[in-house]
């Protein structure tokens, strides 16, 4: 008789990240008997939904069901049928939907209603769709990376899990960049958090954490670009915008109505004598950087120190994991290596932005032109945000680690969100903790 393997005693969870530019579905798996151990939950699948973010479906809500089908069917295949009914599904929408809600709460509700109706049709345990706050987005991102890096585990290890690690239990700060917002979250060093809105208190695995977090709405890379264009077109003498953030020879026509569609450009809105304008790239990093800095109001600070726009920011402390678009953009530009100094990154960006558009298109033939055209802006924006926005220096740049995955799981808010909603992060330390091998990509 053949030996039959005992069924794996595992559990699954699904989180959909409904971002401003796209939606991704993540499937997580963990041993059922080790739910409260740190580092045992891992990602087994990521499915990127084809199409834009859910906020773009506001005039075509009837298409949302089809939009979600492929990835939900993929989840049906990956998760054993016997476990479908007990697998929780959560959808969290971020800044794209926060912006839509600011424009029209009714339209945002309608989108979420249709999303909920669609997701309720699957055999999983659907737990609802909601717009998460910027504070949650920052906090869950911080929990995710520290959980995956084993920072919450009290077990001392005989080996070092990451090459740059100094103090095993020092948590990493989290830097998250999306299309519509950006989050900064970390534990300040013996510093009071002067604004209550930015303070979070956690007790995780028997230890207390006083965490600083802020989410800058409209300062994700896509909305920052819209802001910059709206600001710059104000002073353009005609319908040609010579833009240093695009490669020389690049041309693109922009509708003024599209420019003013987002609440993020309201402060720059004016009546223009034209309905369209043409961006003409001139590819100059320094000028691009200067233009971006004008989006950060640093003239006003009601606290001992600020990031920008009057938002409190304590002195930076410890190492930081920079993920989501921070990672994707820097990875494309080949600037994620630990060995690359801030000066070197700036040098590379200068060269990259100055490259003619025709040359860039040839070198990166496989990349969609819409994305390809924006890497000069995005890379420059990342440098401006980290250096002038968050006050990293040439020295502290070395503390930023551009992270895509840790132990095979994507860095981002979704894992932390699921861990919280499934009560898998105990306040107190469990009796035994497993050794967890952490690596990052």
């Amino acid at each position: 008789t053949q030996n039959k393997a005992l069924p794996e005693n595992v559990k699954y969870g699904i989180v959909l990240d409904a971002g401003s530019s796209h939606t991704s579905l993540y499937i997580y798996k963990w041993p059922a008997e080790k739910e409260n151990d740190t580092g045992v939950v891992h990602q087994v699948e990521e499915c990127r939904v084809k199409g834009p973010g859910i906020s773009k479906f506001v005039q075509k809500v009837n298409e949302i069901g089809i939009y979600l089908t492929d990835c939900m069917e993929r989840a049906r295949e990956v998760i054993p049928r016997s476990q479908h009914q007990e697998t929780p599904v959560y959808l969290g929408a971020t800044a794209g939907m926060r912006l839509l809600r600011m424009e029209s709460e009714e339209l945002a509700d309608r989108v979420l209603d249709v999303v909920e109706r669609s997701l309720s049709n699957y055999p999983f345990d659907f737990q609802g769709a909601r717009i998460i706050t910027g504070q949650e987005e920052g906090a869950y991102g911080w929990i995710t990376i520290n959980y995956l890096l084993g920072k919450f585990s009290q077990k001392t290890r005989w080996f070092s899990i990451v090459p740059y690690e100094t103090n095993n239990q020092e948590t990493f700060g989290a830097l998250d960049l999306g299309g519509a917002s950006t989050q900064v979250t970390f534990v300040p060093q013996n510093q009071t958090i002067e604004s209550p809105d930015n303070a979070l208190q956690f007790r995780l695995y028997g230890k207390d954490y006083n965490v600083y977090t802020h989410s800058f709405l409209c300062y994700g890379k896509d909305q920052a670009l819209w802001q910059k264009l709206a600001k710059d077109i104000q002073v353009a003498s005609n319908e040609i915008l010579r833009d240093p953030c695009f490669h020389p020879g690049y041309k693109k026509v922009v509708n003024v109505s599209d420019l003013y569609k987002t609440p993020c450009t309201k402060r720059f809105e004016m009546t223009l004598p034209f309905q369209q304008f043409e961006i003409q790239g001139i590819g100059n990093y320094q000028q691009c950087h200067q233009s971006i800095l004008e989006l950060f109001n640093t003239s006003y600070c009601p606290y001992s120190q600020c990031a920008f726009n009057g938002i409190f920011l304590p002195p930076l402390a410890g190492s930081f994991g920079a993920f989501s678009a921070f990672y994707f953009v820097m990875k494309f530009l080949n600037l994620t290596s630990e060995k690359v100094s801030q000066e070197k990154v700036t040098e590379m960006m200068k060269k990259f932005c100055a490259q003619p558009w025709e040359e860039i298109k040839t070198s990166y033939a496989g990349v969609k032109e819409k994305y390809l055209s924006e890497y000069c802006f995005s890379g420059t924006y990342i440098l401006s945000l980290l250096l002038q926005g968050y006050h990293f220096t040439a020295d502290s740049w070395a503390q930023i680690h551009f992270i895509g995955k840790i132990q095979g799981s994507d860095a981002g808010w979704t894992l932390g969100y699921m861990l919280n909603l499934t009560n898998m992060i105990p306040a107190e330390q469990p009796l035994s903790t497993p050794l967890s091998h952490s690596t990052y990509v």
């Epitope: 709460e105 509700d109 979420l112 209603d113 909920e116 109706r117 309720s120 737990q127 609802g128 909601r130």
Partner: antibody
């Protein structure tokens, strides 16, 4: 489509309690708060409180604290409003009304048909 | 708590006329927290305007809301026979309160 169906009219004696139900359909029950508003004959609208069906948390108007209890049953998508120590001035039509999603603003988008509660000896 | 005072108590107008209803708050109300409802006899109230000036789905464009701070207005540009009803304003600041209502009746 969204529907809120309330239980039928009640006649109660002073000092008694009444429990009115409101069954929701056509949307994800846990996603929207539910409010209770009453209207005495020929009078205006008076807000009593709200419940978050997702977690069961409640917020009551000061006037009704200690006398009103709002609960929910997620398995049947139903919310309940119980008012105790009834007096004649509690004679009114009681409405449930669907409120906001989390993070939204407090306006009452959809109303039940109303339940008349008469308090009389 | 914030008290909302509606005026006039009754408005007697003919179909086709313009109706202007006022709602005054005892202290400043954020515009996003002011709404208007219509109630006909024997029916539940119906949301008309939210966020002081946004029309709820399906509400005709003859209904418009305006105002900020402590003074808000509901305007019905041309009264239709079905518009004769009681109108309530509502605010939210920790707790919900309603105004006493304005009855729009046929002259």
């Amino acid at each position: 489509q969204v529907q809120l169906v309330q239980s039928g009219a009640e006649v109660k004696k002073p000092g008694a309690s009444v429990k009115v139900s409101c069954k929701a359909s056509g949307y994800t029950f846990k996603s929207y708060e539910m409010h209770w508003v009453r209207q005495a004959p020929g009078q205006g609208l008076e807000w009593m409180g709200r419940i978050n069906p997702s977690v069961g948390s409640t917020w009551y108007a000061q006037k009704f604290q200690g006398r009103v209890t709002m609960t929910r049953d997620t398995s049947t998508s139903t919310v309940y409003m119980e008012l105790s120590s009834l007096r004649s001035e509690d004679t009114a039509v009681y409405y449930c009304a669907r409120g906001k999603r989390e993070g939204g603003t407090e306006y009452l988008r959809k109303w039940g048909q109303g339940t008349l509660v008469t308090v009389s000896s | 708590e914030i008290v909302l005072t509606q005026s006039p108590g009754t408005l007697s107008l003919s179909p086709g006329e313009r109706a202007t209803l006022s709602c005054r708050a005892s202290q400043s109300v954020a515009s996003s927290y002011l709404a208007w409802y219509q109630q006909k006899p024997g029916q539940a109230p119906r949301l008309l305007i939210y966020g002081a000036s946004n029309r709820h789905t399906g509400i005709p464009d003859r209904f418009s809301g305006s105002g900020s701070g402590t003074d808000f207005t509901l305007t019905i540009s041309r009264l239709e026979p079905e518009d004769f009803a009681v109108y309530y304003c509502q605010q939210y600041h920790n707790a919900i309160t309603f105004g006493g209502g304005t009855k729009v009746e046929i002259k």
